[in-house]
């Protein structure tokens, strides 16, 4: 398994990840956002809510 060198993002990227932690993937020359639970998107900009629907009467 190839090792990936990571570090924190520079201050230059402050605000890049809207709802998550910014990680600098050194060998890949890119920033990556590790999103908080409930958020998705390249920059953790989308909120998604998983709604559990109650069972319908027909099913019961």
């Amino acid at each position: 398994v190839a090792q990936v060198s990571i570090t924190k993002c520079s201050s230059d990227m402050n605000g890049y990840c809207l709802h998550g932690q910014c990680i600098y993937l050194v060998d890949m020359s890119q920033n990556y956002c590790r999103c908080e639970v409930g958020y998705t998107g390249v920059r953790c900009e989308h909120f998604f809510l998983t709604v559990h629907q109650p069972l319908s009467k027909e099913y019961v």
Epitope: D12, Y24, Q30
Partner: antibody, heavy 116, light 106 residues
Framework: QDQLVQSGAEVKKPGASVKVSCKAS????????IQWVRQAPGQGLEWMGR????????KYVPKFQGRVTITADTSTNTAYMELSSLRSEDTAVYYC?????????WGQGTLVTVSS | DIQMTQSPSSLSASVGDRVTITCKAS??????IAWYQQKPGQAPRLLIQ???TLQEGVPSRFSGSGSGTDYTFTISSLQPEDIATYYC????????FGGGTKVEIK
């Protein structure tokens, strides 16, 4: 493949404004920051500022503050740099540069000539 | 604003020579420095980022080192195709380029 295609060369008179466009393809500019860099003939590289296309937030070098406006249109995946009150010293190649998802991916450059 | 002082502004060396360029930051930039090569009429080409990480396809004769405020870019054995101007760029806090170093063959 990812590309940043800039608008063509411009010739402007002193005191006028210029607006350079930078159209992205192969990626969404909302996933990136778009920086602008310029280079006068025979001179070094000079960072001007940047925009976060996701929210429109901008940062400018104090030297250009008040004279430069960087904008982005996410519907067309295009960023713009407008420089006003042009003077001869603004004659330069202007580059847009993508950063964020990939470290510093450059456009081909746009030559702006300021001459009376 | 962070200032980047690059030296020398120009140098002349023979093919096969070891060439060293330095950049000094006005404050700690936490290794967030990149090095570019620019040939006349071309856009800059990224060689190294995060002090020492060589980009794909860049020859191993190019290297970088440093920490804190002091950084070095080295060409271990100068080749004719290395004739260009080299720039450092700090990206720790916004961005600032060094003044550039023009490398010529003796």
């Amino acid at each position: 493949q990812d590309q940043l295609v800039q608008s063509g060369a411009e010739v402007k008179k002193p005191g006028a404004s210029v607006k350079v466009s930078c159209k992205a393809s192969g990626f969404n500019i909302k996933d990136t920051y778009i920086q602008w860099v310029r280079q006068a003939p025979g001179q070094g590289l000079e960072w001007m500022g940047r925009i976060d296309p996701l929210n429109g937030n901008t940062k400018y070098v104090p030297k250009f503050q008040g004279r430069v406006t960087i904008t982005a249109d996410t519907s067309t995946n295009t960023a713009y740099m407008e420089l006003s009150s042009l003077r001869s010293e603004d004659t330069a190649v202007y580059y847009c540069v993508r950063s964020g998802t990939l470290f510093d991916f450059w456009g081909q450059g746009t030559l702006v000539t300021v001459s009376s | 604003d962070i200032q980047m002082t690059q030296s020398p502004s120009s140098l002349s060396a023979s093919v096969g020579d070891r060439v060293t360029i330095t950049c000094k930051a006005s404050q700690d930039i936490h290794k967030y420095i990149a090095w570019y090569q620019q040939k006349p009429g071309q856009a800059p080409r990224l060689l190294i980022q995060y002090t020492s990480t060589l980009q794909e396809g860049v020859p191993s004769r190019f290297s970088g080192s440093g920490s804190g405020t002091d950084y070095t870019f080295t060409i271990s054995s100068l080749q004719p195709e290395d004739i260009a101007t080299y720039y450092c760029l700090q990206y720790d806090n916004l961005r600032t380029f060094g003044g550039g170093t023009k490398v010529e063959i003796k």
